[in-house]
């Protein structure tokens, strides 16, 4: 298809040829093209391209362009050739190639497809059935990410209330750019009756740590010492903790934000791998104090998506006073 636009026409530069589009993995869309026929010999060819909504303009010498995009709607790329990297230079006539999502009734596609990466060890995706689907639909979830050679099928399909879901192992690879990439997801049915739904989950978002595990509570003077086990797989600069202390007598609950802290006081079991400690000041030892802890990722490591871990199991210390 030619976009015959007077503003983008130049006399010297012919359009690119053989523009084609293909899909790799689940959501990697790749456009390739050949140089224009009869391009000026003194022209160092560069290619101008942008998507249909004039977004993501790019000028580059390569004869290909790719994008990772959930194929839930039609996407088009327009490409032209020019003799410099100057954005103000008018490229040749722009050639356009589009790719449409798989066929199917849009009302049959699953909705609210979302995934959470639990403790950097497994990903759990969930979705709601589309409006035009039969209640006995058997769903299949496929996933792909950079460290997989091929697309995998998720085996652990489950149902929780109205939601369907599936979970699969996804372990953080140490010392790599693993987390700078994404997981590509597709959900369809075994019978091929529903329109497939796609999602792309960046590995820097939707991360939910496991809850901490409280190991020990002890008093020293009027201070309460709390020791807990950190969730595995995270580095210390990427987590912080919320320690909640409820006092039965005063009916107050105090909340403290805590950095992962070394267990240096003699009151703590020292040098225990992967544990943190915190001293809560001014706690009444002769009353019942109940402690619970949850953990959240730091926005400098993972995108802010408001995902706290579940609360730890509560642990109590002190005596509940008899009401007189």
């Amino acid at each position: 298809d030619y976009k015959d636009d007077d503003e983008s026409r130049t006399e010297t530069q012919p359009p690119v040829t053989n523009l084609s589009v293909s899909v790799e993995n689940l959501c990697t869309v790749i456009w390739t093209w050949n140089p224009p026929e009869g391009a000026s010999s003194n022209c160092s060819l560069w290619y101008f391209s942008h998507f249909g909504d004039k977004q993501d303009k790019k000028i580059a010498p390569e004869t290909r362009r790719s994008i990772e995009v959930p194929l839930n709607e039609r996407i088009c790329l327009q490409v032209g050739s020019q003799c410099s990297t100057n954005e103000s230079e008018k490229p040749s006539i722009l050639v356009e190639k589009c790719i449409s999502p798989p066929e199917g009734d849009p009302e049959s596609a699953v909705t609210e497809l979302q995934c959470i990466w639990h403790n950097l060890s497994y990903m759990k995706c969930s979705w709601l059935p589309g409006r035009n689907t039969s209640p006995d639909t058997n769903y299949t979830l496929y996933y792909w990410h950079r460290s997989l050679e091929k697309i995998h099928q998720c085996e652990n399909i489950f149902r929780e209330g109205q939601y369907f879901g599936c979970s699969f192992d996804l372990t953080k690879v140490k010392d790599s750019s693993f987390e700078q990439h994404s997981v590509q997801i597709m959900v369809k049915d075994n019978a091929g009756k529903i329109k497939p739904s796609f999602n792309i989950v960046p590995l820097t978002s939707r991360v939910k740590p496991d809850p901490p595990h409280i190991k020990n509570l002890s008093f020293h003077n009027d201070d309460l010492y709390v020791q807990w086990e950190n969730p595995q797989n995270f580095i210390s600069r990427c987590l912080f903790y919320e320690v909640e202390v409820n006092n039965s007598q005063t009916e107050t609950h105090n909340v403290f934000y805590v950095q992962e802290a070394k267990c240096e006081n003699p009151e703590f079991e020292r040098n225990v791998e992967n544990t943190s400690c915190f001293m809560v000041p001014g706690v009444l030892p002769d009353t019942l104090n109940t402690v619970r802890i949850r953990v959240k990722t730091n926005k400098l490591c993972y995108e802010d998506d408001k995902l706290w871990s579940n609360w730890s199991q509560e642990m109590s210390i002190g005596k509940k006073r008899n009401s007189t």
Epitope: R237, L239, E242, Y257, A261, K296, N298, K299, D304
Partner: antibody
Framework: EVQLVQSGAEVKKPGESLKISCKGS????????IGWVRQMPGKGLEWMGV????????RYSPSFQGQVTISADKSISTAYLQWSSLKASDTAMYYC???????????WGQGTLVTVSS | EIVLTQSPGTLSLSPGERATLSCRAS???????LAWYQQKPGQAPRLLIY???SRATGIPDRFSGSGSGTDFTLTISRLEPEDFAVYYC?????FGQGTKVEIK
């Protein structure tokens, strides 16, 4: 007591290089991020970037990426902010601050005034 | 990129009055990450509130923070003479432009 002590005021010419410092004490220097904040004369606060001295991991605000370099020497509990070629527009007060994982700046240095003028 | 907009730009009040400062985020943010600072002329800023509502160590209880999502508030219940200053809200790499609380 947590303290961050910054190096003294500097007067420089455009094109010169500069490295200012921020020494932490009274806490585990390697366990907290250090952030740098710029305040131009009569203006508000601007977040420049952070470093985690434990592993020297840095993050820059897009406006300051490539303009400054943040580094740290954990053996002497000191963080640095440096310029390879100063401009008149770099004239400002620069603060370092301790930056816990929840993102507030809970302890601040006294500030280093940098004046760049020909 | 999240933008924090503070209002009003300047608040003219008398000692003993209540001050209400607003900070609005351009998109919903986690309240865990919202902080408030006070800055007096010639001094470094001082942390008042973190996690939207938790008072920092040594901050008097006349200062309180509230809010969630996109709307956050710093309240000074009764202004003391030493409270006249500039107040900033912050979320990680973004600061609001500041609200000046001045004596009427």
């Amino acid at each position: 007591e947590v303290q961050l002590v910054q190096s003294g005021a500097e007067v420089k010419k455009p094109g010169e290089s500069l490295k200012i410092s921020c020494k932490g004490s009274g806490y585990s220097f390697t366990s907290y991020w250090i952030g740098w904040v710029r305040q131009m004369p009569g203006k508000g606060l601007e977040w420049m970037g952070v470093i985690y001295p434990g592993d020297s991991y840095t993050r820059y605000s897009p406006s300051f990426q490539g303009q400054v370099t943040i580094s740290a020497d954990k053996s002497i509990s000191t963080a640095y902010l440096q310029w390879s070629s100063l401009k008149a527009s770099d004239t400002a007060m620069y603060y370092c601050a301790r930056f816990p994982n929840w993102g507030s700046l809970d302890h601040w240095g006294q500030g280093t005034l940098v004046t760049v003028s020909s | 990129e999240i933008v924090l907009t503070q209002s009003p730009g300047t608040l003219s009040l008398s000692p003993g009055e209540r001050a209400t400062l607003s900070c609005r985020a351009s998109q919903s943010i986690s309240s865990s990450y919202l902080a408030w600072y006070q800055q007096k002329p010639g001094q470094a800023p001082r942390l008042l509130i973190y996690g939207a509502s938790s008072r920092a160590t040594g901050i008097p209880d006349r200062f309180s923070g509230s809010g969630s999502g996109t709307d956050f508030t710093l309240t000074i219940s009764r202004l003391e003479p030493e409270d006249f200053a500039v107040y900033y809200c912050q979320q990680y790499e973004t600061f609001g432009q500041g609200t000046k609380v001045e004596i009427k």
